[in-house]
C-alpha cells in the first residue's frame, strides 16, 4: 500500500480551521491478524529523511491521535483529549483520512506527517507516511480562507515505507 498527499501546502489565516488530508492507496490486507493504525505527528525539514523525526501536535502524541481498525474502515477520534486541544482525526471507507485543527495560531505552522502503520500478529510493524506543510499567516498578507496547493504527481504518492 501507499499513502498519497493530495496537497503539499496549506496556507491559512490565523483563527481559521484547516483539515489536512491523506489517502491510503492500493490493496490492504484484511486478514484477522492485521491491524491498521492511521495517525498524525509533526516533524521538521532539513533531515535526511522527511518525517523521520516526530513531535507532538499541540502536545498530543501520535498515539493520542490515532485511529485503528482493519484496512479501509471508517473511524474518527472521539477522544475528549484531542477535542480539548482543537483537534479531530477521521477516516472514511475510501482510504481518506484527515486531521482537523481548529482556531489556528502561528505556532501551528510547520511540517505535518500522516502515517499508516500495518501491524501483524500484534508485533511486526510496516509503515508508510506522507508529508505536507502548513503555513499560518497573520496581517494584511494573510488569505481570508485557507488556500491549498496540490502536490506534484511524484509527491502525491509519497511512498516512504520503512
Amino acid at each position: 500500500f501507499k499513502v498519497a498527499t493530495p496537497y503539499s501546502l496549506y496556507v491559512c489565516p490565523e483563527g481559521q480551521n484547516v483539515t489536512l488530508t491523506c489517502r491510503l492507496l492500493g490493496p490492504v490486507d484484511k486478514g484477522h491478524d492485521v491491524t491498521f493504525y492511521k495517525t498524525w505527528y509533526r516533524s521538521s525539514r532539513g533531515e535526511v529523511q522527511t518525517c523521520s523525526e516526530r513531535r507532538p501536535i499541540r502536545n498530543l502524541t501520535f498515539q493520542d491521535l490515532h485511529l485503528h481498525h482493519g484496512g479501509h474502515q471508517a473511524a474518527n477520534t472521539s477522544h475528549d483529549l484531542a477535542q480539548r486541544h482543537g483537534l479531530e482525526s477521521a477516516s472514511d471507507h475510501h482510504g481518506n483520512f484527515s486531521i482537523t485543527m481548529r482556531n489556528l495560531t502561528l505556532l501551528d505552522s510547520g511540517l505535518y506527517c500522516c502515517l499508516v502503520v500495518e501491524i501483524r500478529h500484534h508485533h511486526s510493524e510496516h509503515r508508510v507516511h506522507g508529508a505536507m506543510e502548513l503555513q499560518v499567516q497573520t496581517g494584511k498578507d494573510a488569505p481570508s480562507n485557507c488556500v491549498v496547493y496540490p502536490s506534484s504527481s511524484q509527491d502525491s504518492e509519497n511512498i516512504t515505507a520503512a
Epitope: P56, T61, F62, S124
Partner: antibody, heavy 121, light 112 residues
C-alpha cells in the same frame, strides 16, 4: 544532540529493590519508546521491558513482568526502571535505549551509558 | 520467542584482514508486507554501551564506516568488516525486532 543519561552505580543487598533513571534530551521524549536492556558480567544483552512516555503504557518481557516496574516523569523527560526482590544473578549493567517504533518493534538507535547494579550480601 | 545464534563466539583476525560474523534466527525475520528483514547489528567496546551499526539487515546507520556491511535474508545473516581497523576490535551483537526483542550471544572480534 539526542542523548540518554543514566543514574550512577548502585550496590544492593539480596531482596532489596533498585530504581535506575534515564534522562532524555535532544528530542521529543513523549513520542519515542524507552527500553531497558541488561547485560550480566561477560554475558550478552537481554531485553527487560519498554514504556511509551506519552501514555505511560509499559510492555514487559515475561521473565521480568512480576519484578520490573517502568515509569516516566514527563516534566523532567526521565524514565525509570525499578527492579524488586533482587538476587545475585541480577548483578548487571542496565541500559536504557530508545526505539523508533510507533506500534510494533524497532531497532535501538540511541543508548544510555549504562548503570552498574551489584547485588551482594 | 525467536532465538538468535551467533558464531563464532570469538574470531581472531589480524588488522587489515576481513572479518565475517554469522547470525542465525530460529525463524524467519523477513516481513512479507515490505520484504524487509527485521535484523540489526550493534558494536560494543569494553566499558561502553552498544552502538547501532546496521538495521534492516543491510542498511548502515549514518556515520558508520563503509567497511561494515550486512547481508542475508530470512534466517541467516552476515556482518562483514572488509578491512579491520584497530578500533573495530569489539563484541558484535545481532538483534531481531520482528517479534518482541531478542539478541544473539555476541561474537568477540579480537586481534590475532
Amino acid at each position: 544532540q539526542v542523548q540518554l543519561v543514566q543514574s550512577g552505580a548502585e550496590v544492593k543487598k539480596p531482596g532489596a529493590s533498585v530504581k535506575v533513571s534515564c534522562k532524555a534530551s535532544g528530542y521529543s521524549f513523549t513520542d519515542y519508546y524507552i527500553n531497558w536492556v541488561r547485560q550480566a558480567p561477560g554475558q550478552g544483552l537481554e531485553w527487560i521491558a519498554r514504556i511509551f512516555p506519552g501514555s505511560g503504557n509499559a510492555y514487559y518481557n515475561e521473565k521480568f513482568k512480576d519484578r520490573a516496574t517502568l515509569t516516566v516523569d514527563k516534566s523532567t523527560s526521565t524514565a525509570y526502571m525499578e527492579l524488586s526482590s533482587l538476587r545475585s544473578e541480577d548483578t548487571a549493567v542496565y541500559y536504557c535505549a530508545r526505539d523508533d517504533s510507533f506500534y510494533g518493534y524497532w531497532y535501538f538507535d540511541v543508548w544510555g551509558q549504562g548503570t552498574t547494579v551489584t547485588v551482594s550480601s | 520467542n525467536i532465538m538468535m545464534t551467533q558464531s563464532p563466539a570469538t574470531l581472531s583476525v589480524s588488522p587489515g584482514e576481513r572479518a565475517t560474523l554469522s547470525c542465525k534466527s530460529s525463524q524467519s525475520v523477513l516481513y512479507s508486507s515490505n520484504q524487509k528483514n527485521y535484523l540489526a547489528w550493534y558494536q560494543q567496546k569494553p566499558g561502553q554501551s552498544p552502538r547501532l551499526l546496521i538495521y534492516w539487515a543491510s542498511t548502515r546507520e549514518s556515520g558508520v564506516p563503509d567497511r561494515f556491511s550486512g547481508s542475508g535474508s530470512g534466517t541467516e545473516f552476515t556482518l562483514t568488516i572488509s578491512s579491520l581497523q584497530s578500533e573495530d576490535f569489539a563484541v558484535y551483537y545481532c538483534h531481531q525486532y520482528l517479534s518482541s526483542y531478542t539478541f544473539g550471544g555476541g561474537t568477540k572480534v579480537e586481534i590475532k
